[in-house]
Interface confidence: medium
């Protein structure tokens, strides 16, 4: 990703206490959970690589940045961070690499200031549709989330629950239209074969979308038209063969966009002509001079920008009676 790293930040707000929050006695002001390191000055708690199996109950109320990385949490239940008084200042929550395989509905409820959430590198076989919205209402209260990092959350093949992994993730992103304010979404390294057609239209605030290192073959049914604020679109290391006219026109129409297309297996035949013409004219593609053909064999490693229409032919398809073995 070309933008600054999605590290937990000190961004926060104050918020009213939530009477419905749960959990034990409020922690003492200077209390720090066992196996954690706390800095009140930095408003940061780090419980890193400690093989924790659940979220500590006695998190200090001042926490703004919470790192729970490298643990063995397995399941994040509803209200996993609900406390009395609530963690009203918690703005950045990093749960990456903590062996989570299930995130239940309402797992992040009662975190009124949560702006950044990183669930990367967890094998999420079961991500509830209401993990982020917290309720099954058709329109939920807006989530405060602005940045959602879901890189490499695909579980091993044998742990998937006989359903589309793409569909499961998208259901969680769209439930209750709670993530209308989401500005950064990272979905890299998830073996996505396709992007459900309605997902982007319902995330109109996106500025940064990272779909790199997936297995996307085509963007034909994906519309970028509504994403008028999109600044970066990462599509490196996918299985894209060609971008068609409709996609090219939509990308060109986005006022702030930068698109990253490196390391895709571009097929340089007659269907590539429009894309090559567009590449020569556009300024939205970063590193466009690095894009090369993968197929057909005779075109391998040719630079797309150096192709002309004579190079881009389609072998005629012979009628069955004339085909040779």
């Amino acid at each position: 990703s070309s933008s600054p790293t999605s590290s937990a930040s000190s961004f926060s707000s104050s918020a009213p206490f939530l009477a419905s929050a749960v959990s034990a006695q409020p922690p003492l002001p200077d209390q720090c959970p066992a196996l954690c390191e706390c800095s009140e000055a930095a408003r940061t708690v780090k419980c890193v690589n400690r093989n924790l199996t659940e979220v500590p109950t006695d998190l200090p109320a001042y926490v703004r940045n919470l790192f729970l990385t490298g643990n063995q949490l397995a399941v994040l239940p509803a209200g996993a961070f609900a406390r009395r008084p609530p963690l009203a200042e918690l703005a950045a929550l990093n749960l990456s690499g903590s062996r989570l395989d299930e995130v239940r509905a309402g797992a992040f409820e009662h975190l009124p200031s949560l702006r950044q959430l990183d669930l990367s590198h967890n094998p999420l076989a079961d991500l509830s549709p209401f993990a982020f919205s917290g309720s099954n209402a058709s329109v939920s209260a807006p989530s405060p989330l602005v940045e959602l990092i879901l890189n490499h959350i695909v579980p091993p093949e044998d742990e998937r629950q006989n359903r589309s992994f793409e569909g499961m993730v998208v259901a969680a992103l769209l439930a209750g239209r709670a993530l209308q304010g989401l500005r950064r979404l990272e979905l890299a390294s998830n073996h996505f074969l396709y992007l459900p057609r309605d997902v982007l239209a319902q995330l109109p605030s996106l500025r940064h979308l990272d779909l790199s290192n997936n297995s996307l073959v085509s963007l034909t049914y994906v519309s970028f038209r509504n994403l008028t604020h999109l600044e970066s679109l990462h599509l490196e290391d996918n299985a894209l063969k060609v971008l068609h006219n409709g996609t090219l026109a939509e990308l060109q129409g986005l006022p702030h966009i930068r698109v990253f297309l490196d390391n895709n297996p571009w097929v340089c035949d007659c269907h590539m002509a429009d894309m090559v013409t567009w590449l020569k004219e556009t300024e939205v593609v970063q590193g466009k001079d690095r894009l090369t053909c993968a197929y057909p064999e005779k075109m391998r490693n040719r630079v797309l920008l150096e192709l002309n229409s004579a190079d881009l032919d389609c072998d005629p398809i012979l009628p069955p009676s004339l085909q040779t073995s």
Partner: antibody, heavy 119, light 106 residues
Framework: EVQLQQSGPELVKPGASVKISCKAS????????MHWVKQSHVKSLEWIGR????????TYNQDFKDKASLTVDKSSSTASMELHSLTSEDSAVYYC?????????????WGQGTLVTVS | FVMTQTPKFLLASAGDRVTISCKAS??????VGWYQQKPGQSPKLLIY???NRYTGVPDRFIGSGYGTDFTFTISTVQAEDLAVYFC?????????FGSGTKLEIK
């Protein structure tokens, strides 16, 4: 503690250039955009642009595209802005400002400002 | 996006409730913030995303609004609130500010 320490006031002649700096400390310098803002009596606060210290990528307000150049020196955690072809209209206080979420432009931290006088 | 801020000046006594308005030329969702700039100082972030108080900001500072109309209220003015207040949109680059409201205390 996050701190942005700007260079001192500058008195420059019309047509000249000036480079002002902003030394950052107390956070991961390459992790967040650095923004620059102009404050003058004429136009209040104006956003000039931002730079990504991670890779040097810049985004400018078109009104300042030919006026300002933003750079960073990662080794010293310093952001700089050079102003070109100065006129009296460029006399102002210039601030570096930090947003602590990379997708937003709420400026939670500001430098103390650098006064540039063109005369 | 033009942010039109009114009034330019406000005169209030300690204990008063004051309100500042900011109108965007087009919808900016809830992407508006408010800053306070005391004499001789840099601006300070008070409110972001229209209604969220930044860390450490007293709860007498209140923001509201959505779309094109935004309001900033100081529920009980105190002497130390003497400052210029600015709105800002963070909806789309270039990010733009209102012209400011100078609050003076009687």
């Amino acid at each position: 503690e996050v701190q942005l320490q700007q260079s001192g006031p500058e008195l420059v002649k019309p047509g000249a250039s000036v480079k002002i700096s902003c030394k950052a400390s107390g956070y991961s310098f390459t992790g967040y955009y650095m923004h620059w803002v102009k404050q003058s009596h004429v136009k209040s606060l104006e956003w000039i642009g931002r730079i990504n210290p991670y890779n040097g990528a810049t985004t400018y307000n078109q009104d300042f595209k030919d006026k300002a150049s933003l750079t960073v020196d990662k080794s010293s955690s310093t952001a700089s802005m050079e102003l070109h072809s100065l006129t009296s209209e460029d006399s102002a206080v210039y601030y570096c400002a930090l947003s602590t979420m990379i997708t937003t432009a709420w400026f939670a931290y500001w430098g103390q400002g650098t006064l540039v006088t063109v005369s | 996006f033009v942010m039109t801020q009114t009034p330019k000046f406000l005169l209030a006594s300690a204990g008063d409730r004051v309100t500042i308005s900011c109108k965007a030329s087009q919808s900016v969702s809830n992407d508006v913030g408010w800053y306070q700039q005391k004499p001789g100082q840099s601006p300070k972030l008070l409110i972001y995303f229209a209604s969220n108080r930044y860390t450490g900001v007293p709860d007498r500072f209140i923001g509201s609004g959505y779309g094109t109309d935004f309001t900033f209220t100081i529920s009980t003015v105190q002497a130390e609130d003497l400052a210029v207040y600015f709105c800002q949109q963070d909806y789309s680059s270039p990010f733009t500010f209102g012209s400011g409201t100078k609050l003076e205390i009687k």
